[in-house]
Structure formats: C-alpha cells, structure tokens
Amino acid sequence: GSMAHSDGIFKKEQAMCLEKIQRANELMGFNDSSPGCPGMWDNITCWKPAHVGEMVLVSCPELFRIFNPDQDMGVVSRNCTEDGWSEPFPHYFDACGFDEYESET
C-alpha cells in the first residue's frame, strides 16, 4: 500500500542523506568539533552542514510529490545558530501537508 511505499522512500532518502552529509563534511572540512551545524536527517528530509548565520532552504520531500504531483513544491528553512539548528519554518505540516508522524507509521 501507499504507507509501505512511503516508508521505502523515506529509508532510501535517509541513506542518500547520510552519504550527502559525509561528502559535504569532507568538502567543507567539517568534523565533530567544528563550529556550525552538522548535517542531519530529521526523519523528513536532509539538511546539509551549515555555518553559523547561514539559512538553509529545502523543498518538501519526495513523498510530498507523490501525494501532490501537480503542484508547486513547498519550501522549509532552518537557521544555523550558535545553539545549533533552529526549528523548521514553516513547520512541515503547514508547508508540506504532512509531518513526521506519517513517515513513522
């Protein structure tokens, strides 16, 4: 069913994300003690490593395209602060129409 399909997509996206983060860390010279925000998979989408003060924008994830194939992609942002990543804005539920609970069921 669609839930099993979406679960498969999220697992694939997560694996790709971890690879992307590793490559980005190498390119940017990031390590565990570097200032800034480490790349992360937040159970919805992938966030590349960022420097303090940087705002990162991502499109709503692949699952969103399946449910809404004909529409403009929503965009979610996070700021990299001295305290780490900010909350996403807008929240996924309002930007994309679904949230993390659906990806876990």
Epitope: Q71, V75, P90, H91, D94, A95, G97, D99, Y101, E102
Partner: antibody, heavy 123, light 107 residues
C-alpha cells in the same frame, strides 16, 4: 456532503468552562487527510483561530498561544465529533465560535464550517 | 504571529462592477493564503486557496493573485449575492491569522 453541527450552551459564567461540540457527518474525525479546527469571531478581535486536532497514526493538537494555557480540543472517535473546552473564561471570550474542517491542497484551508454558536460570558 | 491587513475596510459598488480587495502579510507567506466570504449571521465560506486556486463550486468571476506579502481578490461583474464581507487568511504558520475584513455594500 460534509456537514458540521455544533452544540453547546450559549451562556457561560465568568471563571467557568466553555464547552462546545462539533458533530461531523460525511467525513471522519480520524481521517488522515483532514484537520479539525475551532475559530471564534468577535467585533473586537475579528476572526481568531484557536486550535486544531488531527490524526496521523497518532493524535496531535496545535493551539494558539493566546489561549494555550486554557484550551483543550478532544476528538471523540466513537461519535465522530470533536470538542472545545476553554477554561477560566472572562467576558473577553464572548464571541461566535465555529468549528471547521481543514483540508490540504497546496495549503491548509477551511472548506466546511459549522453554523456557529454565540457564546456570551456573563454572570 | 503573522499580521494580516486588508484594504479597503469597506467599499461601495454596483452590480456589474469589477472590484479588487488587497491583503498584505507582515512577512512573506509564499502562496499560503485563502480568501473567504461571509454574510451576516452565517459562517465564512471558502472562495480561494493557495493564493489563486478557485474552490469547487465557486463562480469563475472570483479570482485571486499574488505571492509573498501582497495578494488581491478580484470579483469581475459583481452580482447581487456578492455583497458581503471578505477575509484573507494566512496558512503558512500557526496560529493561522485572518485579515480584519473588507465589507462590500451596494452603492
């Protein structure tokens, strides 16, 4: 055809609890595609979104900060309805209260509304 | 919270007129905007969502446009049943917030 039917008292005393119910026909409160919202309207504050509940494998609520400490929205799956409770009311809570269904298509919008209930807070 | 403002607050028009109502958000909201019509003693009725998409069953004389902070609702060839109050509402971030409304009455 989706319909929302509101019920509850129209007069509440200050410091007491305002309780309203919204009965859903033509849809289910447990739908994975909808949200269930409460909104109020008064001359002084205009239209004010109060909160929502929705089911996506588990129940989740979101509330407006202005009422967060006083509000509870509860789904009742056995009757396919949802309720609003607002504690410690004051005359400023006097308003017409509406329930509404939220649906998604590029954004969340409120496509079906209850008939509205005028609630007066007065002793 | 995101503040929504509308102009004008009221306008007088005649049947057959073309009218435009403007809504402005205090910060960019992309196209996460809906328009509603309300008649006295009734609940609001959805007209437009996602800035420009017409709700099913709404006549095509209603149209929406805009993105970011500035939006417009246009009614072409105003009909007698269109005399009402119109509200915009942002849906990018909770709490959802509404404009104060624009009352359209008969000239």
């Amino acid at each position: 055809q989706v319909q929302l039917q509101q019920s509850g008292p129209g007069l509440v005393k200050p410091s007491q609890t305002l309780s309203l119910t919204c009965a859903i026909s033509g849809d289910s409160v447990s739908s994975r595609y909808a949200t269930w919202n409460w909104i109020r309207q008064s001359p002084s504050r205009g239209l004010e979104w109060l909160g929502r509940t929705y089911y996506r494998g588990q129940w989740k609520n979101h509330y407006a900060v202005s009422v967060k400490s006083r509000i509870t929205i509860n789904p009742d799956t056995s009757k396919s309805q949802f309720s609003l409770q607002l504690n410690s009311v004051t005359p400023e809570d006097t308003a017409v209260y509406y329930c509404a269904r939220g649906m998604w298509n590029q954004n969340w919008f409120l496509d079906h509304w209850g008939q509205g209930t005028l609630v007066t807070v007065s002793s | 919270d995101i503040q929504m403002t509308q102009s004008p607050s009221s306008l007088s028009a005649s049947v057959g007129d073309r009218i435009t109502i403007t809504c402005r958000a205090s910060q960019p909201i992309s196209r996460y905007l809906s328009w509603y019509q309300q008649k006295p003693g009734k609940a609001p009725k959805l007209l437009i969502f996602a800035g420009q998409r017409l709700q099913s069953g709404i006549p095509s004389r209603f149209s929406g446009s805009g993105s970011g902070t500035d939006f417009t609702l246009t009614i072409n060839s105003l009909q007698p049943e269109d005399f009402a109050t119109y509200f915009c509402q942002q849906a990018i971030s909770i709490p959802y917030t509404f404009g104060p409304g624009t009352k359209v009455d008969i000239k």
